[in-house]
């Protein structure tokens, strides 16, 4: 589908001191759906600070945040996710500053979890896998990954790889032998919903076997 | 209240371009993308393609892909539909419209008739 | 491209009576419960005014007498109740994948 912009561009608020951002969780909690916004600016002081989102809600014509620590949150099922919501920065009933924003642009997907890698001495190959909530899910349910991968002892020489898919296969010959790897996986929307980055998984963590000596090859 | 308010009707001829504008007011320029939609004679509705004023990012339809341009003035809240290489099948009614949502079009332009013909 | 479908081409109306507009779509235009459906109104010499949005929701200020229905490949538009000035062409329209595309129009007149 076309778009506007990267997945993960955000519309900046104006340029003042209230300026946030905010990502949604479709079918977060269930059938709930979440929205989390938080200032640019982290020593905003947000004590009498509140968010409002209105419009594109099924029922009700506003919703109100709770706030939690430096967060601004709401899990609700009366998104209507067609349409722009207008979010305020509000102190009382003063609206300091607002976004137009489509919540289905906006979607950050849970970490993907559960993820392995096996060697396959035969093939010569490790079969890295993992597994996503989002396979479950009725709405955000096509997710590009990001696997990136990199030798423990180089600091920030990752390798990246995208794929749709929750497997993939490392041909043993693209690395190292007797070598210890890093790896992890991060998912983003991809069809119809936009939106960012999700954390990435905890990191799994193997070891390349040695040169076979025999034939100089590796096994 | 919310208008888009188009340019004047205008006759080329084949292989020209044309460049038509949609002045957006009564709401905040930036909030809403803003489409292009064409209507050939007794036809039907063709979407073209759409610019997000905020970024200057587009989205075009392949069929017009390398024809069209579509750009923005954010100091006169206006857009711009610029269409080249112009031939009879080109004849057609253009609007602008904003995009309420992904993707629906919930304020429209007057309409821009662009002729072709040698 | 999605390719939509309108049926009928032209239908005439009882003023007071119900009138019926479907579109089907060559592929679905659904997301779970999302459906990226719209419908429009045009007379003669205007632009289109968006009736409907969403497949069931009513855009602000469009008489309730419109409404909307259904999903994936199906959809509905239906006048409950005619009047004089819902005479006019009638154009459904998806948004689920680019290019945009928009059916070939059903015209309602009087009867």
């Known amino acids: 589908e076309s778009g506007y912009a990267q997945n993960g561009d955000l519309e900046d608020a104006e340029l003042d001191d209230y300026s946030f951002s905010c990502y949604s969780q479709l079918e977060v909690n269930g059938s709930q759906h979440s929205l989390t916004c938080a200032f640019e600016d982290p020593d905003v002081n947000i004590t009498n600070l509140e968010f409002e989102i209105c419009g594109a809600l099924v029922e009700v014509k506003c919703l109100n945040f709770r706030k939690l620590q430096e967060i601004y949150f709401i899990e609700t099922k009366k998104f209507l996710l067609i349409g722009k919501s207008n979010i305020c920065v509000k102190v009382g009933e003063k609206s300091l500053t607002c976004k137009k924003i489509d919540l289905t642009t906006i979607v950050k997907p849970e970490a993907p979890f559960d993820l392995s890698v096996v060697y396959r001495e035969g093939a010569n190959d490790f079969v890295v896998t993992f597994n996503t909530s989002h396979l479950q899910k009725k709405y955000v349910k096509v997710l590009m990954h990001d696997v990136a991968y990199r030798q423990e002892k180089d600091e920030n020489k990752w390798t990246h790889v995208n794929l749709s898919s929750t497997k993939l296969t490392l041909l043993q010959r693209k690395l190292q032998p007797a070598a210890m790897y890093e790896i992890k996986v991060r998912s983003i929307p991809d069809h119809y919903f936009k939106g960012f980055w999700s954390e990435w998984s905890p990191s799994y963590y193997f070891r390349t076997p040695e040169i076979n000596n025999s034939s100089g090859e590796m096994d | 209240q919310v208008q888009l308010v188009q340019s004047g009707a205008e006759v080329k001829k084949p292989g020209a371009s044309v460049k038509v504008s949609c002045k957006a007011s009564g709401y905040r320029f930036t909030d809403y993308e803003l489409h292009w939609v064409r209507q050939a004679p007794g036809q039907g509705l063709e979407w073209m393609g759409g610019?997000?004023?905020?970024?200057?990012?587009?989205a075009y339809n392949q069929k017009f892909k390398g024809r069209v341009t579509m750009t923005r003035d954010t100091s006169t809240s206006t857009v711009y539909m610029e269409l080249s290489s112009l031939r009879s099948e080109d004849t057609a009614v253009y609007y602008c419209a904003r995009s309420g949502g992904r993707w629906y079009f919930d304020v429209w332009g007057q309409g821009t008739t662009v002729t072709v013909s040698s | 491209d999605i390719v939509l479908t309108q049926s009928p081409d032209s239908l005439a109306v009882s003023l007071g009576e119900r009138a019926t507009i479907n579109c089907r779509t060559s592929e679905s235009v659904s997301i779970h419960l999302l459906h990226l459906m719209h419908w429009y109104q045009q007379k003669p010499g205007q632009p289109p005014k968006l009736l409907i949005y969403?497949?069931?929701n009513l855009e602000s200020g469009v008489p309730d007498r419109f409404s909307g229905s259904g999903s994936e490949t199906d959809f509905t538009l239906t006048i409950s109740s005619l009047q004089a000035e819902d005479v006019a062409v009638y154009y459904c329209q998806q948004s689920i994948k680019d290019p945009y595309t928009f059916g070939g129009g059903t015209k309602v007149e009087i009867k």
């Open positions: 610019i997000d004023p905020k970024t200057g990012g587009t």
């Open positions: 969403g497949a069931s």
